[in-house]
Interface confidence: low
Amino acid sequence: VSLRIQEGCSHLPSCCPSKEQEPPEEWLKWSSASVSPPEPLSHTHHAESCRASKDGPLNSRAISPWSYELDRDLNRVPQDLYHARCLCPHCVSLQTGSHMDPLGNSVPLYHNQTVFYRRPCHGEEGTHRRYCLERRLYRVSLACVCVRPRVMA
Amino acid sequence: VSLRIQEGCSHLPSCCPSKEQEPPEEWLKWSSASVSPPEPLSHTHHAESCRASKDGPLNSRAISPWSYELDRDLNRVPQDLYHARCLCPHCVSLQTGSHMDPLGNSVPLYHNQTVFYRRPCHGEEGTHRRYCLERRLYRVSLACVCVRPRVMA
């Protein structure tokens, strides 16, 4: 499969196989590279209430518990991203695992992740049969963290 | 620049420009895609003690504070990864911001991130002048989280 760097794609390496293979097996293998959140999704139902479990994955044992929301885009690499959604506005008491402690806020930790979007190639013979990968920064929430509130101005 | 999918590279799209351009400008632009941790590095000195600040970035305000350690590999995409290093074995008291609360553990949240390594291409004419990208899962610690200890068996 012939690939090209596309100047129109942010001057970044862009792979443009024939559209006959759209989506080609290679694309599927590559784009499904990162499909799992840091903690197993099978357990996230434990965290669906504002409490900290004493067992299970980190997102349910954390005193800033969170669940994962799937963000799927078949024209993106990776296709699947997971956003952490905080289940409590405040942190859960370490003592009880259920009551909220107003001295702490449960807040998402954001990260600008590099992703690649599959776009039509420009300035290329037979553009209808080619595509390129366009790099973008995409904001994802990785987890929820228990923090001390900011000092009031 | 002509690019090829290399069967020897995990059957994944692999871009093999001439080695004359090693490292080509395109590679540098792409591989430096993700060079910043979720929180500004300029502030991490605030977190270099086992306490939770009331100001600054999340990693220093968290009651499971962490600093970032740079992991640089010029033959990897992204070249720069940041590992969260927990500064306290236990969580910091929300009340004082300094004392550790033995009821909570400060633990790293790990994630298998997709990275691409630049490798010599195999089974290719003039292999000494080409390289491919090989996908790998690479474990990074994203942040530190305050959790309730697991139930003892």
Epitope: T96, M100, D101, P102, L103 | C50, Q95, T96, S98, H99
Partner: antibody
């Protein structure tokens, strides 16, 4: 402005109980600990215990455990300190203080409790 | 319990002079880069007033002539220069471990 207003003076007999109140205003009541400290006549300060009203979490000085109960009513922003099985040595001025970082940045005016037969 | 020993028990200082009060803890009150020692002023018939928190931090609204120093087990409250309204009892308090404890107090009088 932050204010802590305590209930009036009490005279009790030995063996009785006393309940002192501390009404807070001017800040987020649930987010700060309330400390209780007492001072016997001509003596120094002695910490009794503390409560975080938002979750009802308490810590007590072992010396008073079993005799003291600290509670909070978030609907009225009031904290109560009840001391039972009173004895003459419990005669003191009882103070409430807003605690942050385990030091008192604002204090009530004090409540005099006299234990006498 | 951590015992705090204040000295002197009382002192008399002329206005404009320096007053130094010390507080020694029976064990360290330091944790993770902070010294959990605080200083209060108490005038007759009034509640204590916070002057210094965590060894050296001046509480908002407290005059700059008050300062605190020290770490580990030895701490000092300095008033320089002393003014007439500084006549009071001064107490140190530790919060590094429960129970919170106070020193017996130092009575400052003016000459």
């Amino acid at each position: 402005q932050v204010q802590l207003v305590q209930s009036g003076a009490e005279v009790k007999k030995p063996g009785a109980s006393v309940k002192v109140s501390c009404k807070a205003s001017g800040y987020t009541f649930s987010s700060y600990w309330i400390e209780w400290v007492r001072q016997a006549p001509g003596q120094g300060l002695e910490w009794i215990g503390q409560i975080l009203p938002g979750i009802g979490s308490t810590n007590y000085n072992e010396k008073f455990k079993g005799r003291v109960t600290i509670t909070a009513d978030t609907s009225t922003s009031t904290v109560y300190m009840e001391l039972s099985s009173l004895r003459s040595e419990d005669t003191a001025v009882y103070y409430c203080a807003r605690g942050y970082g385990n030091y008192g940045d604002y204090w009530g005016q004090g409540t005099t409790v006299t234990v006498s037969s | 319990d951590i015992v705090l020993t204040q000295s002197p028990a009382s002192l008399a200082v002329s206005p404009g002079q320096r007053a130094t009060i010390t507080c020694r803890a029976s064990e360290s009150v330091d944790s993770y880069g902070n010294s959990f020692m605080h200083w209060y002023q108490q005038k007759p018939g009034q509640p204590p007033k916070l002057l210094i928190y965590r060894a050296s931090n001046l509480e908002s609204g407290v005059p700059a002539r008050f300062s605190g120093s020290g770490s580990g087990t030895d701490f000092t409250l300095t008033i320089n220069p002393v003014e007439a309204q500084d006549t009071a009892n001064y107490y140190c308090q530790q919060s590094n471990e429960d129970p919170l404890t106070f020193g017996a107090g130092t009575k400052l009088e003016l000459k």
